[in-house]
Interface confidence: low
């Protein structure tokens, strides 16, 4: 018994000595190591070409940024069980092994940004990082987000994905990130926001999607974002935005929509109405079409400014018409076509405005119908839309008067949206993506087509109410 006890104390002494040695372990040559207030190994901007060997196992913080490290091998930091902060940004990382961060169960901050050659990250790379609250992947040249890349990161609060080359947001990419508050996606090449892109982000406070190529937002894209306070969509390719998408944003305070090719005709009515009721702070929403309203702020227009349907033969060359076919250069949603089946949303020239003819388009005198133009052309085809200057204008300082900006009415039947099967995937269908607040969800065929309030077969009562409030289209 006594011998066992002596052996135990010898073992204890050895363990204590080993621990002490770990803290006082030799520091890698290009690094500074210190113990107070946290055990830190600091090697920034030292010209290192590989993760240094001999990093003290007791390290709680490791700074390796600003070097020339090109590869993070599997289990590079496995011995550092207490690691909470790891910075590898501003290197030349081209490859990170899937098991590079194995064993780092206590890791809270991981910065991999400014590694433009990275381009892709194995979906298993971050598995097991259950305490991670900040992840920097900005400026990594990322072209896609692999399935399950962020799986299990339940503690994540800040996710930086800006300034990459992302073209799409796969369904359920962020599903497990129920505690995420900040999501930075600006400066990518994202062209649409599908229905399930932001599922699960119940705590999101700030969503930055500016300087992308977004032309289409699914009406249900923001369904889980009830706590969102800041939404930036400026400098994209939006010509319309379904108000149904904005309806779930009960906490929204700051909205930026400038630098988009907004079409301010009758299809913009729902968005206009939503903006009139919005009590938060919003940017200007400058119109691109029709020409007579170009540069004017949608928010400052009167309801009766939003008349008719603008058609363009090319960027910023509108033609107004009372008659349109699928063959027109930028095409028109059916709500602007007098021969469409949905007669409730079309004003045929010469017909009196009546309850059955509410929200209809008029033909301004002197405007002739277009000829067959040069084929579909995108409005604002530059890579990131119209880029703002280095100093973005501040948001209009409107203090919220109520805790919830009111949404647009969402009652009404489900209707097929205003793009036929024939044309629904073409860019010109996007001109008809007006807000669908009054038209319900719309059982669209694929995410490319969106319903519009003015394109829906509105119940007689709602048509009368809208006619009274908004006047004729």
């Amino acid at each position: 018994m006594k011998r066992a006890s002596a052996g135990g104390s010898r073992l204890l002494a050895w363990v204590l000595w080993l621990q002490a040695w770990q803290v006082a372990a030799p520091c890698p040559g290009a690094c500074v190591c210190y113990n107070e207030p946290k055990v830190t190994t600091s090697c920034p901007q030292q010209g290192l070409q590989a993760v240094p060997v001999g990093i003290p196992a007791a390290s709680q913080r490791i700074f390796l940024h600003g070097n020339r490290i090109s590869h993070v091998p599997a289990a590079s930091f496995r011995a550092c069980r207490n690691l909470t902060i790891l910075w590898l940004h501003s290197n030349v990382l081209a490859r990170i092994d899937a098991a590079a961060f194995t064993g780092l169960a206590l890791l809270e901050q991981l910065d991999l940004s400014d590694n433009a050659q990275l381009r892709s990250v194995d979906p298993a790379t971050f598995h097991g990082l259950g305490r991670l609250h900040t992840l920097h992947l900005d400026r990594c040249g990322l072209q896609e987000l692999g399935p399950g890349l962020f799986r299990g990161l339940a503690a994540l609060q800040y996710l930086y994905l800006q300034d990459n080359a992302l073209q799409a947001l796969p369904d359920d990419t962020f599903r497990d990130l129920g505690n995420l508050t900040h999501l930075f996606l600006h400066g990518n090449r994202i062209s649409s926001v599908p229905e399930r892109a932001f599922r699960g982000l119940h705590s999101l406070d700030r969503l930055l999607l500016h300087q992308n190529r977004v032309a289409h937002v699914h009406p249900h894209a923001f369904r889980d974002l009830g706590r969102l306070m800041t939404l930036y969509l400026f400098a994209n390719n939006l010509s319309a935005l379904p108000t149904e998408a904005l309806a779930p944003l009960r906490a929204l305070q700051y909205l930026r929509l400038n630098d988009n090719p907004w079409v301010c005709d009758c299809r913009a009515r729902p968005l206009w109405a939503w903006l009139q009721k919005f009590r938060g702070s919003s940017s200007e929403v400058p119109c691109s079409l029709p020409q007579r309203l170009a540069g004017r702020d949608l928010k400052r227009l009167a309801a009766n400014d939003l008349q008719g349907c603008a058609v363009a033969t090319g960027p910023y060359h509108p033609i107004w018409t009372g008659r349109a076919t699928d063959e027109e250069p930028l095409g028109l949603p059916k709500c602007c076509q007098p021969d469409a089946a949905d007669k409730a949303s079309v004003l045929e020239p010469g017909r009196p405005a009546s309850a059955g003819n509410a929200l209809k388009g008029r033909v301004p005198p002197g405007d002739s119908p277009p000829g067959n133009g040069s084929g579909p052309r995108h409005i604002n085809d530059s890579p990131f839309g119209t880029l703002p200057g280095s100093a973005e204008p501040p948001l209009t300082a409107v203090r919220p008067e109520g805790s919830e900006p009111p949404g647009f009415p969402t009652s009404g039947p489900r209707r097929r949206p205003g793009c036929s099967r024939k044309n629904r995937t073409r860019s010109h269908c996007r001109l008809g993506q007006a807000g669908s607040g009054g038209g319900g969800t719309g059982d669209s065929e694929g995410s490319g087509a969106l319903p519009s309030l003015t394109c829906s077969l509105t119940p007689l009562g709602l048509a009368l109410v809208l006619w009274t409030v908004l006047g004729p289209c």
Epitope: V32, Y34, T40, S42, P44, Q45, R61, F63, H65, G66, W87, H89, S90, Q109, D111, S113, D114, T134, H136, D138, R139, Y160, S390, A391
Partner: antibody, heavy 127, light 109 residues
Framework: EVQLVETGAEVKKPGSSVKVSCKAS????????VSWVRQAPGQGLEWMGG????????NYAQKFQGRLTITADESTSTAYMELSSLRSEDTAIYYC????????????????????WGQGTLVTVSS | YELTQPPSASGTPGQRVTISCSGS????????VNWYQQLPGTAPKLLIY???QRPSGVPDRFSGSKSGTSASLAISGLQSEDEADYYC???????????FGGGTKLTVL
């Protein structure tokens, strides 16, 4: 609100060293850089160097390389500036200033602004 | 000094005064500009950061702008308490450090 408090005035002989401290009260240095800026009598401001305490590795203006040592003690929220081989032209008010450190991906010594500033320490070098 | 400012400027109360700051592509041309106000006998104080942003507490009479390799500070509705030295500053990529202008002494007549 964070305040930076510097040590009192010093009179030094040419060839000697001076060490000035700068303590943050009402906050820590954790997410900030601390820079040192000096101002000779009747002259403008001159940046000397800076440090982010959690990194422990300083950055010096070329003019002061080899003569300047900037350190920081994160546990006491104190930064230090030591200038050696003093000459009469080093007579100046030495200010410490806090610089927002804007987060992970930014380099340790990124362009940002100084706010707040310490009250300044007058160092007089005279024989 | 890497950044060039006029040594002095003056104006009468209520007037608008502009102070210029000229640099190069490695400082102002590629980084943001900050402005500091130094009242007589006191430490400098941040006046404008990131070209045109005002910290809380700075009156909106002060505004900043940047174009190319130059920046300017405008003070409208000049007041006697604005009499001070004003410094511009920017990060310099080639020097890997902060550079200041020589300062402009503003006199309110």
């Amino acid at each position: 609100e964070v305040q930076l408090v510097e040590t009192g005035a010093e009179v030094k002989k040419p060839g000697s060293s001076v060490k000035v401290s700068c303590k943050a009260s009402g906050g820590t240095f954790s997410n900030y850089a601390v820079s040192w800026v000096r101002q000779a009598p009747g002259q403008g401001l001159e940046w000397m160097g800076g440090i982010i305490p959690i990194f422990g590795i300083p950055n010096y203006a070329q003019k002061f390389q080899g003569r300047l040592t900037i350190t920081a003690d994160e546990s006491t929220s104190t930064a230090y500036m030591e200038l050696s081989s003093l000459r009469s032209e080093d007579t100046a008010i030495y200010y410490c200033a806090r610089k927002p450190y804007l987060g992970g991906r930014y380099s340790a010594f990124t362009p940002s602004w100084f706010d707040p500033w310490g009250q300044g320490t007058l160092v007089t070098v005279s024989s | 000094y890497e950044l060039t400012q006029p040594p002095s400027a003056s104006g009468t109360p209520g007037q608008r005064v502009t102070i210029s700051c000229s640099g190069s592509s490695s400082n102002i041309g590629s980084n943001t500009v900050n402005w500091y106000q130094q009242l007589p006998g006191t430490a400098p104080k941040l006046l404008i950061y990131s070209n045109n942003q005002r910290p809380s507490g700075v009156p909106d009479r002060f505004s900043g702008s940047k174009s190319g390799t130059s920046a300017s500070l405008a003070i409208s509705g000049l007041q006697s308490e604005d009499e001070a030295d004003y410094y511009c500053a920017a990060w310099d990529d080639s020097l890997n450090g902060v550079v200041f202008g020589g300062g402009t002494k503003l006199t309110v007549l």
